[in-house]
Structure formats: structure tokens, C-alpha cells
């Protein structure tokens, strides 16, 4: 489900860029961090790829956006939206948000100044 995103800059241009990149490695990387290496999560076999490899693939994908820095918040919001229904309780939601906000730093990007992840209409 795609929702209106973006608080910073040209949101429609960011939305197009976010649409073009594959956010799955980022989603898998975060799920790996919060579920632990030993657990399989949903349809992803998160044990098949080491966490560091997954993180690198995630960073590479984010780098594919023309305006990585400017569109970072929209990318994080989309990852949250994509995974929202898979998060089974509020503690998991909090962990996911925390790991998500750490993602830019892990990829050596600047963290967005303001990025509201509570954008899923009460779903997450």
C-alpha cells in the first residue's frame, strides 16, 4: 500500500526515486537485527545472508537514489510501511523504528533532521 510521503523537499520526486530502488535488503537487515541471527522471519530466510552483507546491499540500494540525502526520510517511511503488518507487537514496532533511524548512520549518510515514522494511519 502506497501512501503520501515526504516532509522534506520535492516529495513526488522522492517518491519516484524510492519506488525505483529495492528496499528488501534494508527490510531484511533490520528484521535480522531485531529477530536475531537464529530465527527465520516470514518468507525471508534471513539466515541465508550474513547481516553485514545485507547491510551493504541495503546501503548500495539507498545510494542508487539520485538524492539519497534528501529522500532518506521517504525511504525510511516506506520501509516502515512495507513491514508494518509483519510486526506482531508494540515492542517489535519500537525496536524496528529504532533500528530504522540508525540505518542512515550505518550507511554513512546524514540522518534526516526530522522524520516521522508514525505515518501509517494507526497501523504501526
Amino acid at each position: 500500500m502506497r501512501r503520501e510521503r515526504g516532509r522534506q523537499g520535492d516529495s513526488s520526486s522522492c517518491e519516484r526515486q524510492v519506488d525505483r530502488v529495492n528496499l528488501k535488503p534494508c527490510e531484511q537487515h533490520i528484521m535480522q537485527r531485531i529477530m536475531g541471527e537464529q530465527e527465520q522471519y516470514d518468507s525471508y530466510d534471513i539466515r541465508s545472508t550474513r547481516s553485514s552483507d545485507q547491510q551493504q546491499r541495503c546501503c548500495d540500494e539507498l545510494n542508487e537514489m539520485e538524492n539519497t540525502q534528501r529522500c532518506m526520510c521517504e525511504a525510511l517511511q516506506q520501509i516502515m510501511e512495507n513491514q508494518c503488518d509483519r510486526l506482531q507487537d508494540r515492542q517489535m514496532v519500537q525496536q524496528f523504528k529504532r533500528e530504522l533511524m540508525n540505518l542512515p548512520q550505518q550507511c554513512n549518510f546524514r540522518a534526516p533532521q526530522r522524520c516521522d515514522l508514525d505515518v501509517s494511519g494507526g497501523r504501526c
Epitope: 508494518c84 507487537d89 508494540r90 515492542q91 517489535m92 519500537q94 494511519g121 494507526g122 497501523r123
Partner: antibody, heavy 115, light 107 residues
């Protein structure tokens, strides 16, 4: 399977304090948040708040700020509820309960406040 | 605060009947809703989490549906063992309000 075992019934005088424990087993303690719920005699369930077992950050419902404290001892997989300045209206059964797909309830602890 | 309104407050039905309890949230809660069953003198137990997921070990005659503000718990064929009070509970990050409960009796 998930099991939550609470401490036994308590009788206290008004103004005293009580600490209820909730020992978890059968799952990774830090995986699910722990809720505390109050049920006064003959009444419905009242959500008191929850504590994130990863960060130990408590969240209290509006009516349960001040005299109520949630805490954890992750080394023994136990959550605690402490109530200070007890009043007669605190007489109730207190339950701990986990969130999520493994959602489970403790058996309850009756706290009676009477002079 | 999010308010949860359950209806009816009491329900009387015959063994084998299909029974429906509804729960309405004062604002959208997505699918962050659980249903609990409490039999007299015992602790509640979780039946349904995240609106429609049946907790393992719970009989398949129980089902949950809904999202946003309107939710339903259905017992497809009421059994004597189902006599209890049923509570809905919303559980977002900052709150966890319960409905006032629905007492289910056998006619």
C-alpha cells in the same frame, strides 16, 4: 510454552507499599513487552501500562502515574509492579500479561488494602 | 485516550448458535486489537491478537476480523465451555485500553 507466575496474595494497611512479581518462562524474556492490568472486585479489566523489556522503558496509563512503578530484573526474567501510598480503592487483582503472538497472562495477585 | 466500546454488554444464545461481539475504537488503531476470554474466578486468556490471528491452542470456532475502528469476534458454534466474559483491547505503542466486556451466557 509461555508461562507467567505471579507472587502470592498481599494484605496491606492504607499508606503502605506492595511489590508484585511476575516471573516469565518458556520464551526469551526480552522479546515481548510486559503489561500490567488491574481488575477491581466485580469490575472489568483496566490497563495500567506496559514496560519494554528490551529498554526497560515504562509507559503508564493516565490513571496510573505517580504511585505505580514498573521495573525489571532481566537476569531472573522477572517483571515487578510496585504500588506506594496504598488506598482502599487499590484493592484488586493485578495481572501481568505479555504482548504479541505468544500473548499470555499471569494467574493474578490479589492485593487487599484494609485497616 | 482511545476509547473502546463493546456491544452487546450481555449476550444469551443457544448451544450451536453463531455468536458475534463487536468492538469499536474511538480512532483508527489499524489492526492492533486483541480479544481476551475470562471465565469466572480465573485469569483472562488471549484468543486473538492483531485483530484476526488465532492464538495457538485456541479452538478454530473463534475468529476475529476488522481493521481501523470496527472489529468483530465470532464464535461459529457456541459451546457450553464458551460461557465467559469477552474483552477487546487495543494495544498501540502508548496505550492499551480494554472494552467494558461482553458476558456470554447459554440460553
Amino acid at each position: 510454552q509461555v508461562q507467567l507466575v505471579q507472587s502470592g496474595s498481599e494484605l496491606r494497611k492504607p499508606g503502605a507499599s506492595v511489590k508484585v512479581s511476575c516471573k516469565a518462562s518458556g520464551y526469551t524474556f526480552t522479546k515481548y513487552g510486559m503489561n500490567w492490568v488491574r481488575q477491581a472486585p466485580g469490575q472489568g479489566l483496566e490497563w495500567m501500562g506496559w514496560i519494554n523489556t528490551n529498554t526497560a522503558k515504562p509507559t503508564y496509563a493516565q490513571d496510573f502515574t505517580g504511585r505505580f512503578v514498573f521495573s525489571l530484573d532481566t537476569s531472573v526474567n522477572t517483571a515487578y509492579l510496585e504500588i506506594s501510598g496504598l488506598k482502599a480503592e487499590d484493592t484488586a487483582v493485578y495481572y501481568c500479561a505479555t504482548d504479541g503472538s505468544e500473548g499470555s497472562w499471569g494467574q493474578g495477585t490479589l492485593v487487599t488494602v484494609s485497616s | 485516550d482511545i476509547q473502546m466500546t463493546q456491544s452487546p454488554s450481555t449476550l444469551s444464545a443457544s448451544v450451536g448458535d453463531r455468536v458475534t461481539i463487536t468492538c469499536r475504537a474511538s480512532q483508527s488503531i489499524g489492526t492492533w486489537l486483541a480479544w481476551h476470554q475470562q471465565k469466572p474466578g480465573t485469569a483472562p486468556k488471549v484468543l486473538i491478537y492483531k485483530a484476526s490471528n488465532l492464538k495457538s491452542g485456541v479452538p478454530s470456532r473463534f475468529s476475529g476480523s476488522g481493521s481501523g475502528t470496527d472489529f468483530t469476534l465470532t464464535i461459529s458454534s457456541l459451546q457450553p465451555d464458551d460461557v465467559a466474559t469477552y474483552y477487546c483491547q487495543q494495544y498501540n505503542t502508548y496505550s492499551g485500553t480494554f472494552g467494558q466486556g461482553t458476558r456470554v451466557e447459554i440460553k
